[in-house]
């Protein structure tokens, strides 16, 4: 049995106002500093207590930052990405990608070409719907007796 983790990927626009100590987070990544395997993207590595990002509450460690003030962060050197943030001005708009873990459980072996796991809500919604239909049918059946 293998453990599997499935993720729900969502994107969000986060607008931050630079506080007294700045935006309040650290980043890793870049074409010269791949932090995630086969991905040269820019990731949030640390959120500082009481900084602008922490007080806003939406940005999380592990989030991937896709753009800053509309400027794409693809194919940037690490230092160039850092400089882009530092020169971003007072009001900063971030396009970020969150990865939410939605399932973590043991599974059997999957054959070649099988889907890499289904998010849990896609299983629960139909099951819940079927349960409701069955309950309704049962109540109708009892009324007819």
């Amino acid at each position: 049995m293998n453990g599997r983790v499935d993720y729900l990927v969502t994107e969000e626009e986060i607008n931050l106002t630079r506080g007294p100590s700045g935006l309040g987070f650290n980043i890793v990544g870049g074409t010269d500093q791949q932090y995630v395997s086969n991905d040269s993207g820019i990731y949030v590595s640390r959120i500082k207590e009481n900084g602008a990002a922490a007080l806003d509450g939406r940005l999380q460690e592990g989030d991937k930052i896709l753009s800053v003030n509309g400027q794409d962060l693809k194919n940037l050197l690490h230092q160039d990405a850092v400089d882009l943030f530092r020169n971003a001005g007072y009001a900063v708009s971030l396009r970020v990608q969150h990865r939410l873990q939605v399932q973590n459980g043991p599974i059997g072996h999957r054959g070649e070409g099988d889907p890499s796991g289904i998010p849990i809500f896609m299983v629960l919604v139909p099951v819940f719907a079927l349960t409701m239909v069955a309950a309704w049918a049962f109540m109708r059946y009892r009324q007819q007796l």
Partner: nanobody, 128 residues
Framework: DVQLVESGGGLVQAGGSLRLSCAAS????????IGWFRQAPGKEREGVSC????????FYADSVKGRFTISRDNAKNTLYLQMNSLKPEDTAVYYC??????????????????????WGQGTQVTVS
């Protein structure tokens, strides 16, 4: 287990030199901003020198500029502090510290203690 271990401290005469090392284990220094801090008896811990994860940006406290040099060897997962022209006021316990990634807010102009998450146990430097 994340660990930083300092070495190279000791007793040296004024005007002498020492080279401190900080060996990291349990993580890869490549992605970490790292720095040297010191604490003299009865004083608060202060930033001495810091270097960002790429090695392109460094900070030195005014009191050590021109005498101390920070460097990193990512292949050896080690941070160094070359200390020349040592003075009695350099006597302190020297600590290395690390933080994942680089701050988006400023250059290394601050070397603040609260920027760093991982700390070594320190090595004593005494200048007579």
């Amino acid at each position: 287990d994340v660990q930083l271990v300092e070495s190279g401290g000791g007793l040296v005469q004024a005007g002498g030199s020492l080279r401190l090392s900080c060996a990291a284990s349990g993580f890869t220094l490549d992605y970490y901003g790292i720095g040297w801090f010191r604490q003299a008896p009865g004083k608060e811990r202060e930033g001495v020198s810091c270097i960002d994860s790429s090695g392109g940006s460094t900070f030195y406290a005014d009191s050590v500029k021109g005498r101390f040099t920070i460097s990193r060897d990512n292949a050896k997962n080690t941070l160094y502090l070359q200390m020349n022209s040592l003075k009695p006021e350099d006597t302190a316990v020297y600590y290395c510290a690390a933080v994942l990634g680089d701050s988006v807010d400023y250059g290394m102009g601050y070397c603040n203690l609260d920027e760093y998450d991982y700390w070594g146990q320190g090595t004593q430097v005494t200048v007579s």
